[in-house]
């Protein structure tokens, strides 16, 4: 009874198409597959950034796979051939592993890479990234930002840099068509007459770094003798109402401070007849239904009622 064996895939490699972290893993079928012509061979692929605790595992019939990686670190991957039990009249047969690694050969001491990179997608419309120059780099150092997301043919360079003392310290991006809910890759590299500059790679999704505009049109309405309804409107822009969470700060007679988080554009406040002054501000953030994370907007302008009967008048700012 001869033991059934199968070879690992051939020519296993990680290919960098220049998309700043989105890599292709590809391979060829194993040698001597003739005995298994009636069989659909599968491949088990495992890959990770070096230093990561866990492997991602994929089982596929294809000869390629694509995914995003952190190019600040190396990448390791391994693959083996799987013969399903239907092909072997028994248990599944696995080949030995074929392994490969990939990393960007660095240049420059780590301190030279940009510091404190910060990207904000203002009102889900305008992306702005800013950074500080690396430690100890001279004023002749210039940083360049490149970006890519699925839908672009190739990585693009920033065309509108924010400058300080002649150095690029940020980028205002153009309109980014169909760029949310997918990985957005950035590389900031640099050049200097004085010393080599270390590149930095960043990946995020735009919907997770949105900073909305603050809410507008804050109003009061007396609902009953002891209830006041606070209302506001969503700001102009592409963010739908269903995507907002709000935080309210209410100050009553300069003493009581109420803070609350709500999902709608209204909040009902219990008051006493003694209330002489009421002020509130609101800010907004994209909620968990539309993103995994977000940035609070600035606070709205303050809306106050003072010394008037709220049942007689609705205040509109």
């Amino acid at each position: 009874d001869t033991e059934i064996k199968v070879n690992p895939p051939q020519d296993f490699e990680i290919v960098d198409p220049g998309y700043l972290g989105y890599l292709y893993l590809q391979w060829q079928p194993p040698l001597s597959l003739d005995h298994f012509k009636e069989c659909t061979v599968e491949y088990e692929l495992k890959y990770r950034n070096i230093g990561s605790e866990t492997w991602k595992t994929i089982i596929t019939k294809n000869l390629h796979y694509k995914d995003g990686f952190d190019l600040n670190k190396g990448i390791e991957a391994k693959i083996h051939t799987l013969l399903p039990w239907q092909c072997t009249n028994g248990s599944e047969v696995q080949s030995s592993w074929a392994e490969t690694t990939y990393w960007i050969s660095p240049q420059g001491i780590p301190e030279t890479k940009v510091q404190d990179m910060d990207c904000v997608y203002y009102n889900w419309q305008y992306l702005l990234c800013s950074w500080k120059p690396g430690i100890g780099v001279l004023l002749d150092t210039n940083y360049n930002l490149f970006y890519w997301y699925e839908g672009l043919d190739h990585a693009l360079q920033c065309v509108d840099y924010i400058k300080a003392d002649g150095q690029n310290i940020g980028c205002r991006f153009p309109y980014l068509e169909a760029s949310d809910y997918k990985d957005f890759y950035i590389c900031v590299n640099g050049s200097s007459e004085n010393k080599p500059i270390r590149s930095s790679y960043f990946t995020f999704q735009l919907q997770n770094i949105v900073k909305p505009l603050p809410p507008v049109y804050l109003t009061f309405t007396r609902e009953s003798s002891c209830e006041i309804k606070l209302k506001w409107s969503i700001p102009l822009g592409p963010i739908p109402a269903r995507c907002f969470d709000y935080e309210i700060e209410i100050r009553e007679d300069d003493t009581t401070l109420v803070t609350a988080t709500v999902e709608n554009e209204t909040y009902t406040l219990k008051t006493t007849n003694e209330t002489r002054q009421l002020c509130f501000v609101v800010r907004s953030k994209v909620n968990i239904y539309c993103s995994d994370d977000g940035i609070w907007s600035e606070w709205s302008d303050k809306q106050c009622w003072e010394g008037e009967d709220l049942s007689k008048k609705t205040l509109l700012r």
């Epitope: 070096i50 230093g51 670190k73 190396g74 990393w103 050969s105 660095p106 240049q107 420059g108 001491i109 780590p110 301190e111 030279t112 430690i135 100890g136 010393k195 080599p196």
Partner: antibody, heavy 116, light 108 residues
Amino acid sequence: EVQLVESGGGLVQPGGSLRLSCAASGFTFTKYGVHWVRQAPGKGLEWVAVKWAGGSTDYNSALMSRFTISRDNAKNSLYLQMNSLRAEDTAVYYCARDHRDAMDYWGQGTLVTVSS
Amino acid sequence: DIQMTQSPSSLSASVGDRVTITCTASLSVSSTYLHWYQQKPGKAPKLLIYSTSNLASGVPSRFSGSGSGTDFTLTISSLQPEDFATYYCHQYHRSPLTFGGGTKVEIK
């Protein structure tokens, strides 16, 4: 097996010059940066310079005016040209492979003695 | 320059002892760029621990590293005869790259 072998050390007079070599084998030389690190007799380690895989260079600024690092990828070799040598340059000079921002393999070292 | 100060500069210990060596940086160093090397007399240094706490290939598990910011530690949980050597911490964060002065571990 990764190997780094230094050569070119010896006795040289103050003010003289010397060129050290580091022959690399067992890995894809073009993908790695390589450092020179020195150690004076009975003392600690002092970083001299690195030649990155892309060809650029970083030096210990205290030494860069007298020392020049270079590499020949066709020969899998790294070099350190040392000019205007002083007694305090007497040391064992090591080359070391850079991998993931650490020096993971070192040569056995070559002794440079600067004395009249 | 970042000064790396090791203490003690030397210590005497017996086989089986727990040994702790500390390294203090004059400026904060990212834990990614703090490494430890072992050097035996007449030999080249050997990478022992990289990125503060990761054992280099082939290094026994009795070695461990920890720390952050400016304070880092190398620990040998149970000293073995082959561990008698000089140990150096090293920062790879800022130029010039610098090493600690070394800690010589000798047989008591």
